[in-house]
């Protein structure tokens, strides 16, 4: 058993049929010695008396808010949560496996630039009685500071019969130099509590590996005389690291109709303009990627050909 | 500790092309190592990230773009002194700071070159003959060093009398290639910045 936060404790249980469970001793936070009784949750049934209560925790019915009282007055609370371990593996029931970029990916993180600011998000089908707490650091043995905000519900989606909820959090490395060469990864730890179930999820990454620029901005078309070609130009996204001559981007320019199976024109360039062939009912799209370190491409920025 | 914005004469900055080739060569070599050594811990997640130039050169700090010198987090650098007669810029206006930056890059390359050559000598003794260093990568390091054209004492190639541990050598190769790729990215960014200045 360990303390998650004040008056909240996590009991780690090996979860299998007829498991013996864990013996837990609760102590009432009071100078009083006599006349103390214990109850669980809203029940008035007295579980025991005395300054300490010893319980055998085997299942979720044994978890919950234990309260010690004296003469009708509440003295203190202890909330017990369960953390299940099945076949040596901690449970991951609360969050959904996003399977990208690999299986058992519960947390996904992205950064728009090298400033040390990043966003992580996760998915769940649970809608109520759910809380998250996020901590982060650079490295684990001698951790350097990363400050994370509160996790918030950022999107709701319908997936077949189920509703899916996306939560996200923004974090900022306390002292980040955009030009630095990372040797220690960022560690992100998410504590998830659903009713009386506790789970924790972690992710470890270098900012350079989670870079995904915003789409290029200000796409403009200029038809070329006596030709089917158009010159398309754009600018670096505002959120990208500066100076741009140091943090350079490369671009992919594509002309395509509404269907992905339609024919297309595609060209890659390091410049902020390109010449392509425009077709009726097609769109010109441009996306960006770090020129020197191939992490993710940005989403497309698009304009219609006409 | 930073690069002044004005200087290089018009025309292609001679080192840019070489630095692009360097990044390409080390990336290809790293990809090849990951594929060939698939049963060794050779991915970014699996290896320890070591920098053999740590406390010996200060490329990131010496080559910091002017715009980033206002960022306190970028300025906790170590002072290191370097020889300052580089020819990469082909310009009399080469500033002291820029020469410091380029000579730091030169020292990095020299250190990696020695490590890679020592390692290759060991890998050539491996009866499995599983992986060797790409001669193109070694040639590209050499070309960029020549373009930088700094005079400095040659570092003797380390020779080892004991029987090499090939497993350890291959893991060390992965560690070295990952670190060198990151440094090659920095070098490319620096050359691109200088070319645009």
């Amino acid at each position: 058993i360990w303390e998650l936060k004040k008056d909240v404790y996590v009991v780690e249980l090996d979860w299998y049929p007829d498991a013996p469970g864990e013996m837990v001793v609760l102590t009432c936070d009071t100078p009083e010695e006599d006349g103390i009784t214990w109850t669980l949750d809203q029940s008035s049934e007295v579980l025991g008396s005395g300054k300490t209560l010893t319980i055998q925790v085997k299942e979720f019915g044994d978890a919950g808010q234990y309260t010690c009282h004296k003469g009708g007055e509440v003295l203190s609370h202890s909330l017990l949560l369960l953390h299940k371990k099945e076949d040596g593996i901690w449970s991951t029931d609360i969050l959904k496996d996003q399977k990208e970029p690999k299986n058992k990916t519960f947390l996904r993180c992205e950064a728009k630039n090298y400033s040390g600011r990043f966003t992580c998000w996760w998915l769940t089908t649970i809608s109520t009685d759910l809380t998250f707490s996020v901590k982060s650091s650079r490295g684990s043995s001698d951790p350097q500071g990363v400050t994370c905000g509160a996790a918030t519900l950022s999107a709701e989606r319908v997936r077949g019969d189920n509703k899916e909820y996306e939560y996200s959090v923004e974090c900022q490395e306390d002292s980040a130099c955009p030009a630095a060469e990372e040797s220690l990864p960022i560690e992100v730890m998410v504590d998830a509590v659903h009713k009386l179930k506790y789970e924790n999820y972690t992710s470890s990454f270098f900012i350079r590996d989670i870079i995904k620029p915003d789409p290029p901005k200000n796409l403009q078309l200029k038809p070329l005389k006596n030709s089917r070609q158009v010159e398309v130009s754009w600018e670096y996204p505002d959120t990208w690291s500066t100076p741009h001559s140091y943090f350079s981007l490369t671009f992919c320019v594509q002309v395509q109709g509404k269907s992905k199976r339609e024919k297309k024109d595609r060209v890659f360039t390091d410049k902020t303009s390109a010449t392509v062939i425009c077709r009726k009912n097609a769109s010109i799209s441009v996306r960006a990627q770090d020129r020197y370190y191939s992490s993710s491409w940005s989403e497309w920025a698009s304009v219609p050909c006409s | 500790r930073n690069l002044p914005v004005a200087t290089p004469d018009p025309g292609m900055f001679p080192c840019l092309h070489h630095s692009q080739n360097l990044l390409r060569a080390v990336s290809n070599m790293l990809q090849k190592a990951r594929q060939t050594l698939e049963f060794y811990p050779c991915t970014s997640e699996e290896i320890d990230h070591e920098d053999i130039t740590k406390d010996k050169t200060s490329t990131v700090e010496a080559c910091l773009p002017l715009e980033l010198t206002k960022n306190e987090s970028c300025l906790n650098s170590r002072e290191t002194s370097f020889i300052t007669n580089g020819s990469c810029l082909a310009s009399r206006k080469t500033s002291f700071m820029m020469a410091l930056c380029l000579s730091s890059i030169y020292e990095d390359l020299k250190m990696y070159q020695v490590e890679f050559k020592t390692m290759n000598a060991k890998l050539l003794m491996d009866p499995k003959r599983q992986i060797f260093l790409d001669q193109n990568m070694l040639a590209v390091i050499d070309e960029l060093m020549q373009a930088l054209n700094f005079n400095s004492e040659t570092v003797p190639q380390k020779s080892s009398l004991e029987e090499p541990d090939f497993y350890k050598t291959k893991i060390k190769l992965c560690i070295l290639l990952h670190a060198f790729r990151i440094r090659a990215v920095t070098i490319d960014r620096v050359m691109s910045y200088l070319n645009a200045s």
Partner: antibody
Framework: QVQLVQSGAEVKKPGSSVKVSCKAS????????LHWVRQAPGQGLEWMGW????????EYAPKFQGRVTITADESTSTAYMELSSLRSEDTAVYYC???????????WGQGTLVTVSS | DIVMTQSPLSLPVTPGEPASISCRAS??????LHWYQQKPGQAQRLLIY???QSISGVPSRFSGSGSGTDFTLTISSLQPEDFATYYC?????????FGQGTKVEIK
Amino acid sequence: QVQLVQSGAEVKKPGSSVKVSCKASGGTFSDYYLHWVRQAPGQGLEWMGWIDPENGDTEYAPKFQGRVTITADESTSTAYMELSSLRSEDTAVYYCARNKELRYFDVWGQGTLVTVSS
Amino acid sequence: DIVMTQSPLSLPVTPGEPASISCRASQSISINLHWYQQKPGQAQRLLIYFASQSISGVPSRFSGSGSGTDFTLTISSLQPEDFATYYCQQSNSFPLTFGQGTKVEIK
């Protein structure tokens, strides 16, 4: 199986014209760009131009502008390349090639030898 | 027009050995570079597109690398059926242009 089948070899006099055909099978004809590329004896490949069979849009290499006409007949899934004012240096194997991507070629025809000789 | 220069023009190789063909562009073309194989009496075959992207059905011994002005086609271990002429082609701008070709011959 996608295939491009070209017409047979031709011998032409200088100053005349030649029209080479390229019949496509497999896949929808108008879903692909169609290009013509030539190769003179012992020489490299030379791109001549492309057509979008869907709308008849064409683009020609400046070197052949005014002398080459590329057309397409959707009903027969056939593309044509006509080269006029032939000279001896136009002696070459002419290839048609196609792709859903405009700028490179994933399927090629077998080639048609055009000999220009007086 | 962008000029593509291949080297060497002729490459004698022993079967089983690796082979590398270089292609250089007269100006930067990013990764807009494609490789083809030509055998006598056969249609051209696309091997690699956009400098390094492999084609399904093309043996994995064929790989491409490069960006900007310098590109390489590598055949890791030459098989008897690989003796052919190889062409690079740029698609950075029109007119599309090809290298002069490299003939890989049996040593």
